[in-house]
Interface confidence: low
C-alpha cells in the first residue's frame, strides 16, 4: 500500500472521523488537505487498497485570486447501507510533486442488532419424524448467541445454552411453530416464525386381502398422525405399463390413475370396475386435518382370470348319416382371461349327455354311433379360461345335411364308448 | 461418524504448562459449542470450560479460572485447552466433548494428565 | 454452586430387574438434567438429556423423569451389558456440575 513520505509536512489538516453503527447506516467520511498551486485529486483508501469506484465528491475552495496561491481541498466519501464489506481502514491518499501523502486513518465499523444470514424455513414433517431447522446470524458485534423458539417457549435456558446454528427435532405430534432469536452486545433480532405442520406418516404394510377378477381387497396399516386424526385414505389404481412406467419410487403415474376414498378406520378398501387378468400397481396416502401423508411406493398386483362371460357365437350344427359336424365363432363377450379350449356337449332324447373338450378348434365333425335315427339331438358349447367354464350356449337342434350344403374337410373325432349312446 | 480425539496430555511438575489438542471430525465443528471435562482418578466428573462455536464466549468455574484457557481453530477443527500453573489437583483425565442442548452428546477417549514431582 | 446428589455410590439387580438410580440438586435446575454411562474403561456417553429426552440410539428400556430438584434414571429390564457408572449433570447453571456416579453391579 503507498506510504507517506518523511521528507515534506503532510498537507492534510482534516483526517477521517469513525463511523460506527448498523446495518443499513448511511454515513460520510471527510478529509481537508490545503495545497499550494493547484489542487490535486484525492484518493480513497480502505485497508491500504485504492477504491476505485468510491462514492466520493471532491471541492476546492481557493484562498486567493492566483492560482498558486493555497487551496483549501475537501473530499467527502460517502458510504450507503452500510454493510459487512464496508468496514475497515479508511485513508485519503493525494500525489503531491511526486510524492505520496496519506491521511491518519478513520474507521468504519459494523455494530448493531444481529442480522440474519438464514431463518428456519416453513416445511412439512411426518408425525414423529426428526428433522433439522437452520438459523444463522452475525454482527458485530460478536459473539452472537442463539435461542431456539418452539410456540413461543425458549428451548434453553439462556441464549447460546443449546443447539445454534442446526435444531434437530427429535419428532412432533402437532403442528408447531419454530423460530430463533439471535442475542449480541446490543440486543436481540427474531427470526421469521417458520410454521412446520404435521402430517401423517407414510402408510405402511400395503397387502392385498382378496382378488376377484374385476375387484381386489386391498388392506395397510396407517401411519402415526399426532394429535390429528385421520379423516379419509386415497388409493390409486393405473393399469402396469408392462412393467415400464412405474418403478418403486416414480412420484407420478404415466397415466390418470382410478382414484378411491376409503373413511378410516378400517384401513381396507374394495376396489371395483377392473379389468380381469391385469396387472395394476396400486399405491395408498392418508389425510388428516393438516394434509395428506406420502404415497406409498406402488406395489404390482394382479387381478385373477375370471371365466368366459358369454357362449361361444354363431354355432351350427349339421348331419349327414353317422356324423355330425359343428362350428361356432369365439365368444363376443369378454372372455375375462386367456382362452384354453371348448367343451361341447350333446344329447339325444332319452339318452345321456356327452361332454367332450374340443381344445381350440372351433369345429368338430362327431362319429355317432348306430344308425343316427336318435331324435331331437341338440349341441351346446362353452368357452373356458384357466378359471373354469363359461355360460353355455343354448342347446342348437343337430338340422339334416342338405345336398349342396358344404362339407368340411376336417379331423373326425370318434365319440368315446364311455359315456355314449347308440340308436337302436 | 462422530469423531473426537484428545491429545497432548502427560506427566509435568506442579507449577508448570500442558497444551492439550482435540482433533474432531464426521460434523460441523463451527456448529457447535464444545466442553474440556476431567475425570479425577476417584471417578468424579469435573466440568473445565466451555467455548462458543465462534469462539467468542468462553467459559470457567473457579477451580481454573485465570489458569486455563480454552480455544479453537474452526479451520483445522480443532478444540485446545492450554493449562499453566499446574496443581497436583489437576491430576485427571481430560476429556474433550460436544455440546448438544448443553449436555455432551459425545466424547473423546480421553488424554491423561499427571501433575506430579 | 449447585449440588447434585447421587445419594447411593452402588446398586446391585439381577438382569431382568427394573432399577431406578436417584439424583438431587441443590436447587430447582428446571429439568435441565442429563445422565451418562460410563462402562469400565471407556468414556461417558450420554444416555438422557433435558431430564427425560433420550439421546439417539440409547435403547428405550432407559428413561428420565423428574422436575424440579429430584430427578431419576430408570432401566426397565436390565441387561447384562448395563453394568456402568452412571452419572446426573445439572446442565442449568454455570458451573454445570455432575453427581458422584452410582455404580451399578450385576448380581
Known amino acids: 500500500a503507498p506510504r507517506g513520505t518523511q521528507a515534506e509536512e503532510s498537507p492534510f489538516v482534516g483526517n477521517p472521523g469513525n463511523i460506527t453503527g448498523a446495518r443499513g447506516l448511511t454515513g460520510t467520511l471527510r478529509c481537508q488537505l490545503q495545497v499550494q498551486g493547484e489542487p490535486p485529486e484525492v484518493h480513497w483508501l480502505r485497508d491500504g487498497q485504492i477504491l476505485e469506484l468510491a462514492d466520493s465528491t471532491q471541492t476546492q475552495v481557493p484562498l486567493g485570486e492566483d492560482e498558486q496561491d493555497d487551496w483549501i481541498v475537501v473530499s467527502q466519501l460517502r458510504i450507503t447501507s452500510l454493510q459487512l464489506s464496508d468496514t475497515g481502514q479508511y485513508q485519503c491518499l493525494v500525489f503531491l510533486g511526486h510524492q505520496t501523502f496519506v491521511s491518519q486513518p478513520g474507521y468504519v465499523g459494523l455494530e448493531g442488532l444481529p442480522y440474519f444470514l438464514e431463518e428456519p424455513e416453513d416445511r412439512t414433517v411426518a408425525a414423529n419424524t426428526p428433522f433439522n431447522l437452520s438459523c444463522q446470524a452475525q454482527g458485530p458485534p460478536e459473539p452472537v448467541d442463539l435461542l431456539w423458539l418452539q410456540d413461543a417457549v425458549p428451548l434453553a435456558t439462556a441464549p447460546g445454552h443449546g443447539p445454534q446454528r442446526s435444531l434437530h427435532v427429535p419428532g412432533l405430534n402437532k403442528t408447531s411453530s419454530f423460530s430463533c432469536e439471535a442475542h449480541n452486545a446490543k440486543g436481540v433480532t427474531t427470526s421469521r416464525t417458520a410454521t412446520i405442520t404435521v402430517l401423517p406418516q407414510q402408510p405402511r404394510n400395503l397387502h392385498l386381502v382378496s382378488r376377484q377378477p374385476t375387484e381386489l381387497e386391498v388392506a395397510w396399516t396407517p401411519g402415526l398422525s399426532g394429535i390429528y386424526p385421520l379423516t379419509h385414505c386415497t388409493l390409486q389404481a393405473v393399469l402396469s405399463d408392462d412393467g415400464m412406467g412405474i418403478q418403486a419410487g416414480e412420484p407420478d403415474p404415466p397415466e390418470e390413475p382410478l382414484t378411491s376414498q376409503a373413511s378410516v378406520p378400517p384401513h381396507q378398501l374394495r376396489l371395483g370396475s377392473l379389468h380381469p387378468h391385469t396387472p395394476y400397481h396400486i399405491r395408498v396416502a392418508c389425510t388428516s386435518s393438516q394434509g395428506p401423508s406420502s404415497w406409498t411406493h406402488w406395489l404390482p398386483v394382479e387381478t385373477p382370470e375370471g371365466v368366459p362371460l358369454g357362449p361361444p357365437e354363431n354355432i351350427s350344427a349339421t348331419r349327414n348319416g353317422s356324423q355330425a359336424f359343428v362350428h361356432w365363432q369365439e365368444p363376443r363377450a369378454p372372455l375375462q382371461g386367456t382362452l384354453l379350449g371348448y367343451r361341447l356337449a350333446y344329447q339325444g332324447q332319452d339318452t345321456p349327455e356327452v361332454l367332450m373338450d374340443i381344445g381350440l378348434r372351433q369345429e368338430v365333425t362327431l362319429e355317432l354311433q348306430g344308425d343316427g335315427s336318435v331324435s331331437n339331438l341338440t349341441v351346446c358349447v362353452a368357452a373356458y379360461t384357466a378359471a373354469g367354464d363359461g355360460p353355455w350356449s343354448l342347446p342348437v337342434p343337430l338340422e339334416a345335411w342338405r345336398p349342396g350344403q358344404a362339407q368340411p374337410v376336417h379331423q373326425l373325432v370318434k365319440e368315446p364308448s364311455t359315456p355314449a349312446f347308440s340308436w337302436p | 461418524e462422530v469423531n473426537l480425539v484428545e491429545s497432548g496430555g502427560g506427566l509435568v511438575q506442579p507449577g508448570g504448562s500442558l497444551k492439550l489438542s482435540c482433533a474432531t471430525s464426521g460434523f460441523t465443528f463451527s456448529d457447535y459449542y464444545m466442553y474440556w471435562v476431567r475425570q479425577t482418578p476417584e471417578k468424579r466428573l469435573e466440568w473445565v470450560a466451555y467455548i462458543s462455536n465462534g469462539g467468542g464466549s468462553t467459559y470457567y468455574p473457579d477451580t481454573v479460572k485465570g489458569r486455563f484457557t480454552i480455544s479453537r481453530d474452526n479451520a483445522k477443527n480443532t478444540l485446545y485447552l492450554q493449562m499453566s500453573r499446574l496443581k497436583s489437583e489437576d491430576t485427571a483425565m481430560y476429556y474433550c466433548a460436544r455440546l448438544h442442548f448443553y449436555a455432551m452428546d459425545y466424547w473423546g477417549q480421553g488424554t491423561s494428565v499427571t501433575v506430579s514431582s | 454452586d449447585i449440588v447434585m446428589t447421587q445419594s447411593h455410590k452402588f446398586m446391585s439387580t439381577s438382569v431382568g430387574d427394573r432399577v431406578s438410580i436417584t439424583c438431587k440438586a441443590s436447587?430447582?435446575?428446571?429439568?435441565?438434567v442429563a445422565w451418562y454411562q460410563q462402562k469400565p474403561g471407556q468414556s461417558p456417553k450420554l444416555l438422557i438429556y433435558w431430564a427425560s429426552t433420550r439421546h439417539t440410539g440409547v435403547p428405550d428400556r432407559f428413561t428420565g423423569s423428574g422436575s424440579g430438584t429430584d430427578y431419576t434414571l430408570t432401566i426397565s429390564s436390565v441387561q447384562a451389558e448395563d453394568l456402568a457408572l452412571y452419572y446426573c449433570?445439572?446442565?442449568?447453571?454455570?458451573?454445570?456440575?455432575f453427581g458422584s456416579g452410582t455404580k451399578l453391579e450385576i448380581k
Open positions: 436447587q430447582d435446575v428446571s429439568t435441565a
Open positions: 449433570q445439572q446442565h442449568y447453571n454455570t458451573p454445570f456440575t
